[in-house]
């Protein structure tokens, strides 16, 4: 089963060449594990095969696969990578339809500095 | 409608370059994605590479890195396709492409020949 | 890169037959999976886009299937205009590719 409030390492295969090398479960599209988030995922990857913008495969790993830090914190990605990618990409997901999860809305996101991420604790996020 | 008018016909010599234009109408030229598609004769199809008309951003296959500039004049809503050091492999119908939903090719311009012989 | 390979690559039909041609990607493509015809001395004309997705005013004799590798164009009356070659093309990855033709005879 999947044990709640622990740093788990990354086995999604794209994710894997990323600056971090453990995540944690659910994200914040609420994904249980990393095979869902895999699957989830899979739609967003034309994206960056088409390559629309340079940060686009970091911004889906730390979305989908988030950094894991001091076991109980989720690191959500940085608001303003997420405006980077979302407007550099904006016209191929329009072309592909593909739906962008509210969840990662960026006006939902933090402003922070992407080397010393802004953490959130799933307790409150995802226990209420 | 949707228009995509290519130039005409071109006869050129090992060595040289080619440059093919193709004029689009009767939508946002700066919407869609732009691609070149070639068709060597008798064969099937092979993609070149495209761009955004709006910023210009162009991505191309690795065979003709190099060797393909593809550029635009959004005053015209015209988009070119420069191809160089051109050999006889290159004799092929080159079409330019609309990309449209699902990232297909909907509307393809009617074609040029490019015949390249000594 | 991508392969896709189209089979058959020639087929003999007759007018009202059903007619089915694959493509099979040598990855998983999920649904990205585009279907042209072509005419001799035309450009190709796109029939369905995403796998499924019947473009505009194409006849709904035309239908499209699959996900993943494997992929399926039906033609489910041949019309005497549809004599044709039909080619796939994957875009999920750089560098777009297509898929060999499948030309439709008159048998």
């Known amino acids: 089963g999947h044990s709640l409030f622990t740093c788990e390492p990354i086995t999604v295969p794209r994710c894997m060449k990323m600056a971090y090398n453990m995540t944690f479960f659910p994200n914040l599209m609420g994904h249980y594990d990393q095979s869902i988030a895999a699957v989830e995922m899979e739609h967003f990857l034309p994206l960056a095969n088409l390559e629309c913008s340079p940060n686009i495969e970091t911004f889906l790993c730390k979305a989908f696969v988030p950094t894991c830090i001091e076991q109980i914190h989720v690191v959500p990605p940085c608001r303003k990578l997420c405006e980077k990618v979302y407007s550099d990409c904006k016209k191929l997901i329009d072309t592909f339809g593909i739906r962008w999860p509210e969840e990662l809305e960026c006006d939902r996101l933090q402003y922070c500095d992407e080397t010393v991420p802004v953490t959130f604790d799933p307790h409150t996020e995802f226990l209420g | 409608q949707v228009q995509l008018v290519q130039s005409g016909a071109e006869v050129k010599k090992p060595g040289a370059s080619v440059k093919v234009s193709c004029k689009a109408s009767g939508y946002t030229f700066t919407n869609n994605f732009m691609h070149w598609v070639r068709q060597a004769p008798g064969q099937g199809l092979e993609w070149m590479g495209g761009?955004?008309?709006?910023?210009?951003?162009?991505i191309y296959a690795q065979k003709f890195q190099g060797r393909v500039t593809m550029t635009r004049d959004t005053s015209t809503s015209t988009v070119y396709m420069e191809l160089s050091s051109l050999r006889s492999e290159d004799t092929a119908v080159y079409y330019c492409?609309?990309?449209?939903?699902?990232?297909?090719?909907?509307?393809w311009g009617q074609g040029t020949l490019v015949t390249v012989s000594s | 890169d991508i392969q896709m390979t189209q089979s058959p690559s020639s087929l003999s039909a007759s007018v009202g037959d059903r007619v089915t041609i694959t493509c099979r990607a040598s990855?998983?493509?999920?649904?990205?999976l585009n279907w042209y015809q072509q005419k001799p001395g035309k450009a190709p004309k796109l029939l369905i886009y995403a796998a499924s997705s019947l473009q505009s005013g194409v006849p709904s004799r035309f239908s499209g299937s699959g996900s993943g590798t494997d992929f399926t164009l039906t033609i489910s009356s041949l019309q005497p205009e549809d004599f044709a070659t039909y080619y796939c093309q994957q875009s999920y990855s750089t560098p777009l590719t297509f898929g060999g033709g499948t030309k439709v005879e008159i048998k």
């Open positions: 492409a609309r990309v449209g939903r699902g990232y297909s090719f909907d509307y």
């Open positions: 761009f955004d008309p709006e910023d210009g951003e162009t």
């Open positions: 990855q998983s493509i999920s649904s990205y």
